[in-house]
């Protein structure tokens, strides 16, 4: 008898090379094989559970950056007046949540912020829990 | 044939709003659906393997905090003279281990330390390994 | 019917007690039960996917340390002029990758660097993905 295989784990790596002041970051998924989807610059959460979250990037100017998952809830990450980020966190997310950026700068210019090595990774830690697609 | 489902992953999120000087923190699990249990202010480890551990909190006074898992072993985390913690770690834990806090303050008062946003998350990383219940 | 078990997750914990200047660190796996293997002071990657990586250690002198996974690619970790490390990261690794250290010191002596509590942990986060053995 063939041993059971794991169904694919919900995970995604998105990249971002620019962020818009007082808006968010333009995220793209470089792989077509991702088990999670991007929609309207947000990562869609289909499965309840803990997620491992990794966020990296170098910015072209000083900015304040927050990563949100639900309206009216506090941010997953919040960094104030930084030119880079390299953070890891764990958070409980649920079906219908959407993970998205908010970015503000102190410059009078409203030009886009350029990002080098911008990467956001989400990995579901509770396969077997509730999912809805 | 129905594809095999994942059995639930061993994981837990506990909250704590107060810690007792020269003792530990009073932990409660907000969800009844957790796959790990709390007993005597300790999280009980049933399954051998690596665990992802996230610890967060803001304290009402400066304290030294350690997170232990086994008598006679070094701590999983150890923070000296802090008013907040936001740490992530990986550790190998085994059946019969118990994860618990030890807290000391430098104040003459022996009152409880109040904690804002106190949260400890453990997530098993090696399903399929040895477990005993 | 017996519920399906998880096949073992690819993971490994290696220890290192010394590093050689302008070379790497001598890594050993304390357990025979590891699901990943060490070869030529490198950890062999058989399975594609995200990996949780934990790196710890205290060094006998100031050094610069990098953790690589593929020739011609940037490091997984890069620390400059440190005497200790306690870092966690997430990276996408693939079959044929090899995880290894590179270390340089600024001392004129070419003696080995002694390491206390040197530990590197890798844990695969995408079981069910492609593996080759």
């Amino acid at each position: 008898q063939v041993p059971p295989q794991y169904p694919p784990i919900q995970s995604i790596r998105v990249q971002f090379t620019r962020c818009e002041n007082e808006k968010g970051c333009i995220i793209t998924s470089p792989s077509k094989d991702e088990t999670m989807k991007v929609q309207d610059n947000s990562i869609i959460i289909n499965c309840d559970g803990f997620y491992l979250i990794s966020l990296k990037g170098y910015f072209s100017e000083e900015l304040s950056l927050s990563l949100y998952y639900r309206k009216g809830r506090g941010p997953l990450f919040s960094l104030s007046k930084v030119t880079s980020v390299d953070s890891i966190g764990v958070a409980y997310l649920a079906f219908k949540d959407k993970v998205y950026f908010n970015v503000t700068t102190h410059s009078t210019s409203y030009k886009d912020i350029q990002v080098n090595g911008g990467e956001l990774i989400l990995i579901h830690q509770n396969p077997g829990g509730f999912c809805a697609y | 044939q129905v594809p095999p489902q994942y059995p639930p992953i061993q994981s837990i999120r506990v909250q704590f709003t107060r810690c007792e000087n020269e003792k530990g923190c009073i932990i409660t699990s907000p969800s009844k659906d957790e796959t790990m249990k709390v007993q005597d202010n300790s999280i009980i480890i049933n399954c051998d393997g690596f665990y992802l551990i996230s610890l967060k909190g803001y304290f009402s006074e400066e304290l030294s905090l350690s997170l232990y898992y086994r008598k006679g072993r070094g701590p999983l985390f150890s923070l000296s003279k802090v008013t907040s913690v936001d740490s992530i770690g990986v550790a190998y834990l085994a059946f019969k281990d118990k994860v618990y806090f030890n807290v000391t303050t430098h104040s003459t008062s022996y009152k409880d330390i109040q904690v804002n946003g106190g949260e400890l998350i453990l997530i098993h990383q090696n399903p399929g390994g040895f477990c005993a219940y | 019917q017996v519920p399906p078990q998880y096949p073992p997750i690819q993971s490994i914990r290696v220890q290192f007690t010394r590093c050689e200047n302008e070379k790497g660190c001598i890594i050993t796996s304390p357990s025979k039960d590891e699901t990943m293997k060490v070869q030529d002071n490198s950890i062999i990657i058989n399975c594609d996917g995200f990996y949780l990586i934990s790196l710890k250690g205290y060094f006998s002198e100031e050094l610069s340390l990098s953790l690589y996974y593929r020739k011609g690619r940037g490091p997984l970790f890069s620390l400059s002029k440190v005497t200790s490390v306690d870092s966690i990261g997430v990276a996408y690794l693939a079959f044929k990758d090899k995880v290894y250290f590179n270390v340089t010191t600024h001392s004129t002596s070419y003696k080995d660097i002694q390491v206390n509590g040197g530990e590197l942990i890798l844990i695969h986060q995408n079981p069910g993905g492609f593996c080759a053995y």
Epitope: S66, G74, P75, S78, S80, K81 | T17, R18, Y58, F59, S60, E61, T83, S84, D86, S107, S109, K111, D112, Q114, N116, G117 | -
Partner: antibody, heavy 118, light 107 residues
Amino acid sequence: EVQLVESGGDLVRPGGSLRLSCVASGFTFTNYHMSWVRQAPGKGLQWVAFINSGGSSTTYTDVVRGRFTISRDYAKNTLYLQMNSLTAEDTAVYYCASGAIWTHFDHWGQGTLVTVSS
Amino acid sequence: SFVLTQLPSVSVTLRQTARITCGGDSVGSKSVYWYQQKLGQAPVLIIYRDSNRPTGIPERFSGASSGNTATLTISGALAEDEADYYCQVWDNSNKAIFGGGTHLTVL
């Protein structure tokens, strides 16, 4: 020197909305926990809402929960209080207060007056 | 919910000792904070965690707490100490509770 400057107080009709702001200077805003405390004319202090330094945790006094929202903008070094469904009982001077330790109100602004009346 | 009770007013003769009390069920088991508010001004933290003085607060201010009562003591009250004084604790739900305030008159 630490400074907290509130603004946004006004006369508003019952059922109306108002957003208060508190601009912080002289300290690292990201490291400080923030609260709103109010004082009705001739009355004592009443704590209204709290947000921790990372913005991840908020708490409210029971009488405002569901109507008021506390938030912070790190780029602008500003604390906000969005007040909806206002009633005459919300009439007060609103102070913002900051603390390096979450339980302390170390520094206070001079307050902004909110009057709810028809 | 937790309630802190203060006397509305206390009088003290200049340079005498004033004691302002704050009553609450087992308040001595909680950390108590005291704030001073002079007329037309914002409050100022004068005692934290029962008995600790922030930098810049004169030594004549001291605090203590046990049982059902917390006490703010002003040893050798000055005219400039005339103000409203508020005790405050955090309840078990991390909500701040203020006492009703005591007005200190220096005679």
